[in-house]
């Protein structure tokens, strides 16, 4: 089970020259620590807007802030705790766009951002704070997803500010791609920390992070570094939850699924999650990028259902996950 820890906030040291110098030299490791976590980490932003002209019409805009090339974008209504949901559109840079009602018009705005208009006629529009999720599959970063929703009291024509959320499902390719940079930075960080080992430590206290404050998590390359580099989840408005008797966790997730904080809008999908997630014969939680197998009639090793999306231009093994499932 992964433990969560917040990066502590430094208390100002005692006044004086030594305090000032100590403050300066201690800030550097924390800056480096932040860089260690975020270096090379792409971000996905999501903006949800209700149109003033049609009260039940939404515009969803999503963008990818990363250097890699985008191979697929999936837009969906977010499901319970951000898992599952239902696909509204898939956009491929070369092979076109496919959408599902009530998606009316999905299009590329730039090479790294898309927009989707969702039509609604009162009855067909979901509740106002429904979560919309955008997932970008890119090379070499892997797969990144963020969600957003209208603020509870938003006026028509207004929109939630774009919500950057460098989360949650990074493929191994992305992790390995930045590990070199991370390794260098972290070695330097450890070197600095060792130099400060014999100095009196300043008083630390955990930061009081509001549940609504933006948070982020990046997958660390190893269990050892995970222990040192924990960052809390990105907080995203969860979708409105109808009264329901269903209490089973969807998709047969691992036992720690139940212990996730309620504001966490996504189940993490890093190597650890894959390793501990059973894949049933007709897999109930197979991420969309696993549908990216070549069109040669080849199915993934598990016969889980799913859209047969556009074949991946980088060949049949390009989207293989940590367990070899595609």
């Amino acid at each position: 089970m992964r433990t969560e820890a917040q990066v502590p906030a430094l208390q100002p040291p005692e006044p004086g020259l030594e305090g000032a110098m100590g403050h300066r030299t201690l800030v550097l490791p924390w800056v480096l620590l932040t860089l260690c976590v975020t270096a090379g980490t792409p971000e996905v932003w999501v903006q949800v807007r209700m149109e003033a002209t049609e009260l039940s019409s939404f515009t969803i805009r999503c963008g990818f802030l990363g250097s890699g090339s985008i191979s697929l974008v999936t837009v969906s209504w977010g499901g319970p705790n951000g898992a599952g949901g239902t696909t509204l559109a898939v956009l491929h840079p070369e092979r076109g766009i496919r959408q599902w009602a009530p998606a009316r018009q999905a299009r590329w705005e730039t090479q790294s951002s898309i927009s989707l208009i969702l039509e609604g006629s009162g009855a067909s529009s979901p509740c106002a704070n429904t979560t919309f999720c955008c997932k970008f599959a890119s090379f070499p970063e892997g797969s990144w997803e963020a969600c957003g929703s209208l603020p509870p009291s938003s006026d028509p024509g207004l929109s939630a500010p774009p919500t950057p959320a460098p989360i949650l499902r990074a493929d191994l390719a992305g992790i390995l791609g930045v590990s070199g940079v991370l390794l260098f930075g972290c070695v330097y960080l450890l070197h600095l920390l060792r130099r400060h080992k014999h100095r009196p430590a300043p008083r630390l206290q955990p930061s009081r992070t509001s549940p609504q404050a933006p948070r982020a998590r990046a997958w660390a390359p190893s269990q050892a570094s995970q222990a040192a580099l924990h960052v809390p989840y990105a907080t995203i408005n969860t979708s409105c939850r109808p009264a329901t008797l269903d209490t089973a966790h969807p998709h047969g997730g691992p036992s720690w699924w139940a212990s996730l904080p309620t504001h966490a809008a996504h189940r993490p999908q890093g190597p650890a999650a894959w390793a501990s997630t059973p894949i049933p014969a007709r897999g109930s939680f197979v991420s969309v990028e696993n549908g990216l197998y070549a069109q040669a009639g080849e199915r993934p090793p598990h016969t889980g259902p799913g859209l047969t999306l556009f074949p991946d231009p980088r060949g049949p093994r390009a989207m293989e996950g940590p367990l070899g499932v595609r």
């Epitope: 969906s76 209504w77 499901g79 319970p80 599952g84 949901g85 239902t86 696909t87 496919r98 959408q99 599902w100 009602a101 009530p102 609604g120 009855a123 067909s124 529009s125 979901p126 509740c127 429904t130 979560t131 979708s239 409105c240 939850r241 109808p242 329901t244 269903d246 089973a248 969807p250 998709h251 197979v286 969309v288 549908g291 069109q295 009639g297 199915r299 259902p305 799913g306 859209l307 047969t308 999306l309 556009f310 074949p311």
Partner: antibody, heavy 120, light 107 residues
Framework: EVQLQQSGPELVRPGASVRISCKAS????????MNWVKQSHGKSLEWIGY????????GYNQNFKNKATLTVDTYSRAAYMELRSLTSEDSAVYYC?????????????WGQGTILTVSS | DIQMTQSPASLSVSVGETVTITCRTS??????LAWYQQKQGKSPQLLVY???NLADGVPSRFSGSGSGTQFSLKINSLQSGDFGSYFC?????????FGGGTKLEIK
């Protein structure tokens, strides 16, 4: 065992409205889209639309946009389809069918069908 | 909308024979196609999903093939329980559409 139990046959007058229900059991209701399909006598199948029970969002075939309204009650685990301004053209068998949501694929379980007869 | 052309519309065959039903789509749907069987007075039952995968409990004498715009359902050594109607359906974007159906009758 997954089951979709639909309401019984309906005989209604032209111009009236009717509400057909589909009660689900044996699975987590909010995890799957519920689709509705029309089959006119001796003809093929026509997709009407779907509803995502988790958030109540629905998508419709444009041909049925002004004819059908889909709703759900997650507490009773039931999906509903209301058909309005009925004419003899609406006489058909109506099915509810479960579809995996995220993957957007096949209908793996179907209700037994509800026969609707519109006649004066 | 994606058009689904299914052929033949009807087929009269004997028990033990092999039949092939085809479904052609108006645009590339990759492998996003399902086949259903419907017996008189009953609801449709899933046979094949994702063009080639047999649904749970479906006998191995049924097989699906094809991708892109051309698909087929093959039934080897027909049995009496196989008679009825067969439909193809795409799920590559909405509106989902079905083929016109193939009625399989005993000769």
């Amino acid at each position: 065992e997954v089951q979709l139990q639909q309401s019984g046959p309906e005989l209604v007058r032209p111009g009236a409205s009717v509400r057909i229900s589909c009660k689900a059991s044996g699975y987590t209701f909010t995890d799957y889209n519920m689709n509705w399909v029309k089959q006119s006598h001796g003809k093929s199948l026509e997709w009407i639309g779907y509803i995502y029970p988790y958030n109540g969002g629905a998508g419709y075939n444009q041909n049925f946009k002004n004819k059908a309204t889909l709703t759900v009650d997650t507490y009773s685990r039931a999906a509903y389809m209301e058909l309005r301004s009925l004419t003899s053209e609406d006489s058909a068998v109506y099915y509810c069918a479960r579809e995996r949501g995220m993957q957007r694929d096949y209908f793996d379980y179907w209700g037994q069908g509800t026969i609707l007869t519109v006649s004066s | 909308d994606i058009q689904m052309t299914q052929s033949p519309a009807s087929l009269s065959v004997s028990v033990g024979e092999t039949v092939t039903i085809t479904c052609r789509t108006s645009e590339n749907i990759y492998s996003n196609l399902a086949w259903y069987q419907q017996k008189q007075g009953k609801s449709p039952q899933l046979l094949v999903y994702a063009a080639t995968n047999l649904a749970d409990g479906v006998p191995s004498r049924f097989s699906g093939s094809g991708s892109g715009t051309q698909f087929s359902l093959k039934i080897n050594s027909l049995q009496s329980g196989d008679f009825g109607s067969y439909f193809c359906q795409h799920f590559w974007g909405t509106p989902y559409t079905f083929g016109g159906g193939t009625k399989l009758e005993i000769k």
